[in-house]
């Protein structure tokens, strides 16, 4: 089970919204807080350790997941071509 603790949005840049979200999750052993279908979720800890973010299925149904080359996060591409980038910190 997960709950969103903080959600900050910055829409000051044209055509770009930066959102910072923190979630608190109660996860089973071997799991850790992550993102599944664009929602906070408990995921296999190995996914986080190896930075194979797309294995969490972080994008919405119908979106395409693409790892950032430096493994700092992932992008979700909507069918229309719009790209949403998520970086992990």
């Amino acid at each position: 089970t997960c709950e969103i603790v903080t959600l900050d949005r910055d829409s000051s840049q044209p055509r770009r919204t930066i959102a910072r979200q923190t979630a608190r999750c109660a996860c089973r052993k071997g799991q850790i807080a992550g993102t599944t279908r664009a929602r906070p979720a408990c995921v296999d800890a190995r996914i986080i350790k190896t930075k194979q973010w797309c294995d969490m299925l972080p994008c919405l149904e119908g979106e395409g997941c693409d790892l950032l080359i430096n493994r700092s996060g992932w992008t979700c591409t909507q069918p229309g071509g719009r790209i949403k980038t998520t970086t992990v910190s």
Epitope: D66, L68, N70, T77, I83
Partner: antibody
Framework: AVTLDESGGGLQTPGGALRLSCKAS????????MGWVRQAPGKGLEWVSA????????SYGSAVKGRATISRDNGQSTLYLQMNSLRAEDTAVYFC???????????????WGHGTEVIVSS | ALTQPSSVSANPGETARITCSGG??????YGWYQQKPSSAPLTVIY???ERPSDIPSRFSGSSSGSTHTLTISGVQAEDEAVYFC??????????????FGAGTTLTVL
């Protein structure tokens, strides 16, 4: 079968520019991250650049950073490498590489092109 | 950088082992690439132990701690080549960037 066919190499002058191409077939090009690896005469393999599936994110080895641009055309199943301000030390065979399982690292290459030779000399 | 021996030799039918160490622990494992003179590299192992379908089963990869090993069981004359290992290096400005070992020449006696 997976095929990666590079072109665009040849004799280049120092300070010049070139664009290498890699035509892919035998797999769904847009589903895989791709990269370029080069090999100077008599030397080992050197990582050059990589690009994610959609083309929105790239990375470069230190030897070419600031002089190279990797791009892709998923509609044409083609990978590109634009190299500017060429130096003698860019002389090498350039190989196109396909990542496995939708991501590419030097540990996950599962297919290579035959290579295209670039010679930078005055 | 990755460290691997410059040369390894084995008699036909014997087992040859090539080791590789170093690089960043990125979780993506190690790759092993065979290259014969005037030819492109050929992937024999990727992601530590996965083998492309057209590679003979005598090629296998394994890891023990920080050492990664390519094992060729029952070496054949056609296995004579240079073998490169591949992994990642990490830098704060570039993140993860691919890196290869200098290559190990396998000689079949």
């Amino acid at each position: 079968a997976v095929t990666l066919d590079e072109s665009g190499g040849g004799l280049q002058t120092p300070g010049g520019a070139l664009r290498l191409s890699c035509k892919a077939s035998g797999f769904t090009f847009s589903s895989y991250q791709m990269g370029w690896v080069r090999q100077a005469p008599g030397k080992g393999l050197e990582w050059v650049s990589a690009i994610n599936k959609g083309g929105s994110d790239t990375s470069y080895g230190s030897a070419v950073k600031g002089r190279a641009t990797i791009s892709r055309d998923n509609g044409q199943s083609t990978l590109y490498l634009q190299m500017n301000s060429l130096r003698a030390e860019d002389t090498a065979v350039y190989f196109c590489a396909k990542g496995s399982a939708s991501y590419i690292t030097a540990a996950t290459i599962d297919a290579w092109g035959h290579g295209t030779e670039v010679i930078v000399s005055s | 950088a990755l460290t691997q021996p410059s040369s390894v030799s084995a008699n036909p039918g014997e087992t040859a082992r090539i080791t590789c160490s170093g690089g960043a622990s990125s979780g993506y494992g190690y790759g092993w690439y065979q290259q014969k003179p005037s030819s492109a590299p050929l992937t024999v192992i990727y992601k530590d132990s996965e083998r492309p379908s057209d590679i003979p089963s005598r090629f296998s990869g394994s890891s023990s701690g920080s050492t990664h090993t390519l094992t060729i069981s029952g070496v054949q004359a056609e296995d004579e080549a240079v073998y490169f290992c591949g992994n990642d290096d990490y830098s704060s400005d570039s993140g993860y960037v691919g890196v290869f070992g200098a290559g190990t020449t396998l000689t079949v006696l």
